[in-house]
């Protein structure tokens, strides 16, 4: 075929077209060449940069049988799901001999209904508590104007006239739905509908009303709960542990808490079956039909000391002349506090009772008055804590000591009125 100055003229006989559409569109850009001799590899450019990972196919067909005959080359670039990142100017590039040829440009543009970058999310909020919702949309075409809706009712007279990316809600008293509409020249897209669930506010002023060694009475002030009445409140108590470090706002303690439910009102609860003289942490949350409030911070509390629940054990009392030797063991029953010591009382048949504070020793030698002829001498022992004395033991008669005999040991004749304490563990 007759030709002019071919090296100077572009070999392209077809250039990329234009694609404009909405996200997700699939399209094909093509370049067509007619070249003499060995067909070149076609490279695709976007905004002047070579696309290394382009989804392109190249078809080349010889138009004759001679090596120097013309070839037709078609390169097709497939855009499988149009995204904003695909937009730009597209060209083909070939190297022929010592020359580089670039096709005329085609353009890929994105134009359609607004596309949401951010949509309002479901969330829970405390009654009458301010919060923000977010919504963000983009075109093209721009501009994109937002219109917020609460329970399907627009919050502005027209798109773009009300709040845009962020909606500030001063507080709700009932569970509500929110959505946003994005408007542009192509039309309207509606976001997902977010449900904002109104929960009771966190209770306030959790405090102790009264304390007993195994019982604490606590009270609190309920928070607002919108149009939903509180159904109950839940109180948790957990044994404090120096290693646990319960602080306000820290994660839940590792132990399984003791959980109690309180009907409301009154906003008060008696917590029983506790250890005496023991540190606890307590917290409370209140529930409506919509769900529970957040927990209060952990409040440190402590049960007071109690008196020992039983008398000392295995009391023995022996007499040798004017001396009496009395020996005992710590009570088996719970002490309900820190043992501070023992009190001992002895009395003869016709003599007044003598009361002694022995301290923490578990034996004592008594110097008896006179020649020791006091008849029917008996001894009683009680343990005490800061809270007071525990029960006295039954009177133990003083026995004469005979050489060669082991010291007589008297078991308690009578058990304490309350059985040995069995502690629940939680």
């Amino acid at each position: 075929a007759p030709r002019g100055t071919q090296a100077e003229e572009s070999p392209f006989v077809g250039n990329p077209g234009n694609i404009t559409g909405a996200r997700g569109l699939t399209g094909t850009l093509r370049c067509q060449l007619q070249v003499q001799g060995e067909p070149p590899e076609v490279h695709w450019l976007r905004d002047g940069q070579i696309l290394e990972l382009a989804d392109s196919t190249q078809t080349q067909v010889p138009l004759g049988e001679d090596e120097q005959d013309d070839w037709i080359v078609v390169s097709q670039l497939r855009i499988t799901s149009l995204q904003l990142s695909d937009t730009g100017q597209y060209q083909c590039l070939v190297f022929l001999g010592h020359q580089t040829f670039v096709s005329q440009p085609g353009y890929v543009g994105l134009e359609g209904l607004p596309y949401f970058l951010e949509e309002p999310e479901d969330r829970t909020v405390a009654a009458n508590t301010p919060f923000n919702l977010s919504c963000q949309a983009q075109g093209p075409p721009e501009p994109v104007d937002l219109l917020w809706l609460q329970d399907a009712v627009p919050l502005a007279t027209a798109p773009g006239h009300g709040p845009q990316r962020s909606l500030h809600v001063p507080g709700l008293n009932k569970t509500s739905s929110f959505s946003c509409e994005a408007h542009n020249a192509k039309g309207v897209t509606t976001s997902r509908t977010a449900t904002i669930t109104v929960l009771p506010q966190q209770p306030r002023n959790l405090h102790l009303v009264s304390r007993q060694p195994t019982e604490l009475e606590v009270a609190w002030t309920p928070g607002l709960s919108g149009i939903y009445p509180l159904t109950h409140c839940t109180l948790q108590a957990v044994l404090s542990d120096d290693g646990m470090g319960i602080q306000a706002g820290e994660p839940d303690p590792p132990e399984e808490p003791l959980t109690s439910q309180a009907s409301v009102p009154p906003h008060q609860l008696r917590l029983g079956s506790l250890h005496p003289h023991t540190p606890y942490h307590i917290r409370v949350a209140c529930t409506s039909s919509q769900g529970p409030s957040s927990w209060t911070h952990w409040l440190p509390v402590e049960t007071p000391e109690g008196v020992p629940l039983g008398p000392p054990e295995n009391i023995s009392a022996t007499r040798n002349g004017s001396q009496a030797f009395v020996h005992w063991q710590e009570p088996r029953a719970p002490l309900q506090g820190t043992l501070l010591g023992y009190r001992l009382a002895y009395q003869g048949q016709d003599t007044p009772e003598v009361l002694m504070d022995i301290g923490l020793r578990q034996e004592v030698t008594l110097e008896l008055q006179g020649d020791g002829s006091v008849s029917n001498l008996t001894v009683c022992v009680a343990a005490y804590t800061a809270a007071g004395d525990g029960p006295w033991s039954l009177p133990v008669p003083l026995e004469a000591w005979r050489p060669g005999q082991a010291q007589p040991v008297h078991q308690l004749v009578k058990e304490p009125s309350t059985p040995a304490f069995s502690w629940p563990w939680w």
Epitope: A1, P2, R3, G4, T5, Q6, E8, E9, S10, V13, G14, N15, P16, G17, T28, R30, Q32, Q34, T59, V61, L63, D70, I72, V74, Q76, Q104, G106
Partner: antibody, heavy 120, light 107 residues
Framework: EVKLVESGGGLVQPGGSLKLSCAAS????????MSWVRQTPEKRLEWVAY????????YYPDTIKGRFTLSRDNDRNTLYLQMSSLKSEDTAMYYC?????????????WGQGTSVTVSS | DIVMTQSHKFMSTSLGDRISITCKAS??????VAWYQQKPGQSPKLLIY???TRHTGVPDRFTGSGSGTDYNLTISSVQAEDLALYYC?????????FGAGTKLELK
């Protein structure tokens, strides 16, 4: 508005010559490739010649090669088809047509045509 | 040369009908197929190129499809002004070749 106006057709004897012209307006002439296509009395369409926008590349079918020459004057926005050694089978309506940007071989605008009759 | 075959010289239709005109290439033309409409006394007008790209101003009732060697021009609802002669053309390589044409007429 794209406009292509052919001229130069007429009656010519076999073996004779004729020069057709195509005046272009309404677009940037030197940016487009151009072709000639003819339509036989039986209404068949036949491609006659192609020229690139700069004029440096011309293509012809084997039936035409060596007899017709296609050229363009980009300053005058005019396309020329010099026809020689005309045969009776060259009798047809001759259209000049513009190539699309996306494929120069697809023809997006055609003139109204000029009639060529080769007869003794 | 690539031969383009339009198997129907004539096709009869009623107004409002959906109709498809077929064209077969003698080899794979990589979707480089154009369709033209010609009315009596007028020059051909481009409808479709690259098998499915609609030319500017062409009504969207005209749709092109196909790949490899088989191509179709579909008119979704035939209007009176669509009664004309339709040609397919391969614009893949030179020599450019056309089909013999299909005349669309009323039943």
């Amino acid at each position: 508005e794209v406009k292509l106006v052919e001229s130069g057709g007429g009656l010519v004897q076999p073996g004779g010559s004729l020069k057709l012209s195509c005046a272009a307006s309404g677009f940037t002439f030197n940016s487009y490739s151009m072709s000639w296509v003819r339509q036989t009395p039986e209404k068949r369409l036949e491609w006659v010649a192609y020229i690139s926008n700069g004029g440096g590349r011309t293509y012809y079918p084997d039936t035409i090669k060596g007899r017709f020459t296609l050229s363009r004057d980009n300053d005058r926005n005019t396309l020329y088809l010099q026809m020689s050694s005309l045969k009776s089978e060259d009798t047809a309506m001759y259209y000049c047509a513009r190539g699309t940007t996306e494929s120069y071989y697809a023809l997006d605008y055609w003139g109204q045509g000029t009639s060529v009759t080769v007869s003794s | 040369d690539i031969v383009m075959t339009q198997s129907h010289k004539f096709m009869s239709t009623s107004l409002g009908d959906r109709i498809s005109i077929t064209c077969k290439a003698s080899q794979d033309v990589i979707t480089a197929v154009a369709w033209y409409q010609q009315k009596p006394g007028q020059s051909p007008k481009l409808l479709i190129y690259w098998a499915s790209t609609r030319h500017t101003g062409v009504p969207d009732r005209f749709t092109g499809s196909g790949s490899g060697t088989d191509y179709n021009l579909t008119i979704s609802s035939v209007q009176a002004e669509d009664l004309a002669l339709y040609y397919c053309q391969q614009h893949f390589s030179t020599p450019l070749t056309f089909g013999a044409g299909t005349k669309l007429e009323l039943k």
